[in-house]
């Protein structure tokens, strides 16, 4: 869980308790077991904007 008093991670990143910092979710492709990757799965990047209704 993110440390109290810290700012939330920006979109596309997730908090790592192992490193005490926000980590880029893109790195989960190479190393999916990293502790922060669970947060990436729970909050995926924003979907593409639909071009039709």
């Amino acid at each position: 869980e993110q440390a109290p008093g810290t700012a939330p991670c920006s979109r596309g990143s997730s908090w790592s308790a192992d490193l005490d910092k926000c980590m880029d979710c893109a790195s989960c492709r190479a190393r999916p077991h990293s502790d922060f990757c669970l947060g990436c799965a729970a909050a995926p990047p924003a979907p593409f904007r639909l071009l039709w209704p």
């Epitope: 440390a3 308790a17 192992d18 490193l19 005490d20 910092k21 190479a30 190393r31 077991h33 502790d35």
Partner: antibody
Framework: EVQLLESGGGLVQPGGSLRLSCAAS????????MIWVRQAPGKGLEWVSY????????HYADSVKGRFTISRDNSKNTLYLQMNSLRAEDTAVYYC?????????????WGQGTLVTVSS | DIQMTQSPATLSASVGDRVTITCRAS??????LNWYQQKPGKAPKLLIY???SLQSGVPSRFSGSGSGTDFTLTISSLQPEDFATYYC??????????FGPGTKVEIK
């Protein structure tokens, strides 16, 4: 100059306890994850334990889980390893090392090591 | 757990030789592979990180390559100070890491 200096090693009987220290200098200690690695006489390197920069998260090798405790005091720039229920197979030189760039992908600075001998 | 193997265990070489050490992982570790040099009675020294990046201050005769499961450390022209034991280390499973058994480079 980055320096890591281990201390606290020595001769201890099986079942005994020992507390190792690793004093850091020459860099800001608090943002860096740290590890302990050991090397039995004439053998290779074995990872022992990991601690996050804040000290809030720790990990251990199966061989020491439940017996060793890693901790840190960022106000004193010091890393610790509390070793309980020591066994003959814990005999080794113990090194502390710093996670490079504040990550755990590689370890760029190591101490000179402190020898722990477990024997009756 | 990820197992690391190295070959050869011991390598006899002469000053000026080109030396290659191989490290193999039991599963793919991408490029999360580091190389260390250790001399007797001394701490390990980081040479190469992320499979092929040269650590600051390390001579350019050292180079690393590979990805996935197979990696190599090459010393282009062996110098007297290079006689030592070399370890590979995977950080794919970090914070838990594993080292290879080491390769001793000795004088022929």
């Amino acid at each position: 100059e980055v320096q890591l200096l281990e201390s606290g090693g020595g001769l201890v009987q099986p079942g005994g306890s020992l507390r190792l220290s690793c004093a850091a200098s020459g860099f800001t200690f608090s943002p860096y994850p740290m590890i302990w690695v050991r090397q039995a006489p004439g053998k290779g390197l074995e990872w022992v334990s990991y601690i996050s920069p804040s000290g809030g998260k720790t990990h251990y090798a199966d061989s020491v889980k439940g017996r060793f405790t890693i901790s840190r005091d960022n106000s004193k720039n010091t890393l610790y390893l509390q070793m309980n229920s020591l066994r003959a197979e814990d005999t080794a030189v113990y090194y502390c090392a710093r996670g490079g760039d504040g990550y755990f992908d590689y370890f760029d600075y190591w101490g000179q090591g402190t020898l722990v001998t477990v024997s009756s | 757990d990820i197992q690391m193997t190295q070959s050869p265990a011991t390598l006899s070489a002469s000053v000026g030789d080109r030396v290659t050490i191989t490290c193999r992982a039991s599963q793919s570790i991408s490029s999360y592979l580091n190389w260390y040099q250790q001399k007797p009675g001394k701490a390990p020294k980081l040479l190469i990180y992320a499979a092929s990046s040269l650590q600051s201050g390390v001579p350019s005769r050292f180079s690393g390559s590979g990805s996935g499961t197979d990696f190599t450390l090459t010393i282009s022209s062996l110098q007297p100070e290079d006689f030592a034991t070399y370890y590979c280390q995977q950080s794919y499973s970090s914070p838990g890491i594993t080292f290879g058994p080491g390769t001793k480079v000795e004088i022929k």
